[in-house]
Interface confidence: medium
């Protein structure tokens, strides 16, 4: 694992530009959005300091048929060097807690921006 400020990411560090594109996409799907994303689907909450892109993808893999996050899923898979199957990183779930997709995306977005600001991906 390549550990970046506690954000473990299997494989090489994603390039800065790709990370910014991911951040921009997460912003796109959350800006001024009040309707529940993906019909209010719930996903496993993950420990963002211990988890990484593959863990985030693992959690979102459980959501299907939601066009709003399909691009995010594709982008996350580009950061993850191996194929992720649902439940693969269950040990990094937060006390078996589930949260709405919208909150998951918001938490992920804030964490990625924090890492970017701190220069973790530059």
């Amino acid at each position: 694992l390549t550990c970046l400020g506690g954000f473990a990411s299997p494989g090489p560090v994603p390039p800065s530009t790709a990370l910014r594109e991911l951040i921009e996409e997460l912003v796109n799907i959350t800006q001024n959005q009040k309707a529940p994303l993906c019909n209010g689907s719930m996903v496993w909450s993950i420990n963002l300091t211990a988890g990484g892109f593959c863990v985030a993808l693992d959690s979102l893999t459980n959501v299907s048929g939601c066009s709003a996050i399909e691009k995010t899923q594709r982008m996350l898979s580009g950061f993850c060097p191996h194929k992720v199957s649902a439940g693969q990183f269950s040990s990094l779930h937060v006390r078996d807690t589930k949260i709405e997709v919208a909150q998951f995306v918001k938490d992920l977005l804030l964490h990625l921006k924090k890492l970017f600001r701190e220069g973790q991906f530059n």
């Epitope: 951040i23 921009e24 796109n28 800006q31 959005q33 009040k34 970017f116």
Partner: antibody, heavy 126, light 108 residues
């Protein structure tokens, strides 16, 4: 104290150009999304456009009536927002306001355009 | 292009409840924001994300939203609340902002 101060307004002939500036202070400008809003004399508010923070992609969106004529830009090192207005028309006559669109967006909050400047008057007339 | 529709004017007596509505097709999925503008002054945000009140805004201001309609309510309107009120939101993409035409609130 969060503050926005616009400048650069004035009288210009139809077809002319003008550049407005908005100096920001009291908050982390580079984190904020910034908007321009205008108000023609005796009329309502009209959204002109918005620029995201660079970390959020720096995307710029414009209202249909100004697209292709107006350009929004920012200089984070100078804490300044700009509005370059070209091919001005008489209907562009208005008070132009800059506003912070998302001071808290970096931290996951969205307060709307919660801080506004005092506005600068642009008059387009022959 | 996307539009938000407001009544041009609303009149109430001091102490009465004033309600200003704003309708738009994207409001079921996009938040509404409300601005107060007094003559010759810059707008002031009074409600954000449908229902939230910024610090410093009196409790008599509240917001609600249902379907394609957002509503600004001023409970016990006071003379100093006389102003133009504008709703603001975005189109369904979230990329383009739009203001309603504005409502002139008269407190007689």
């Amino acid at each position: 104290e969060v503050q926005l101060v616009e400048s650069g307004g004035g009288l210009v002939k139809p077809g002319g150009s003008l550049r407005l500036s908005c100096a920001a202070s009291g908050f982390t400008f580079s984190n904020a999304w910034m908007s321009w809003v205008r108000q023609a004399p005796g009329k309502g508010l009209e959204w002109v456009g918005r620029i995201r923070s660079k970390i959020d992609g720096g995307t710029i969106n414009y209202a249909a009536p100004v697209k292709g004529r107006f350009t929004i830009s920012r200089d984070d090192s100078k804490n300044t927002l700009y509005l370059q207005m070209n091919s001005l028309k008489t209907e562009d006559t208005a008070v132009y306001y800059c506003a912070t669109d998302q001071v808290g967006a970096y931290y996951g909050d969205y307060y709307g355009m919660d801080v506004w400047g005092q506005g600068t008057l642009v008059t387009v007339s022959s | 292009s996307y539009e938000l529709t407001q009544p041009p004017s609303v009149s109430v007596s001091p102490g009465q409840t004033a309600r200003i509505t704003c309708s738009g097709d994207a409001l079921p999925e996009k938040y509404a924001y409300w601005y107060q503008q007094k003559s010759g002054q810059a707008p002031v945000l009074v409600i954000y994300e449908d229902t939230k009140r910024p610090s410093g805004i009196p409790e008599r201001f509240s917001g609600s939203s249902s379907g394609t309609m957002a509503t600004l309510t001023i409970s016990g309107a006071q003379v100093e609340d006389e102003a133009d009120y504008y709703c603001y939101s975005t189109d369904s993409s979230g990329n383009h902002g739009v203001f309603g035409g504005g409502t002139k609130l008269t407190v007689l």
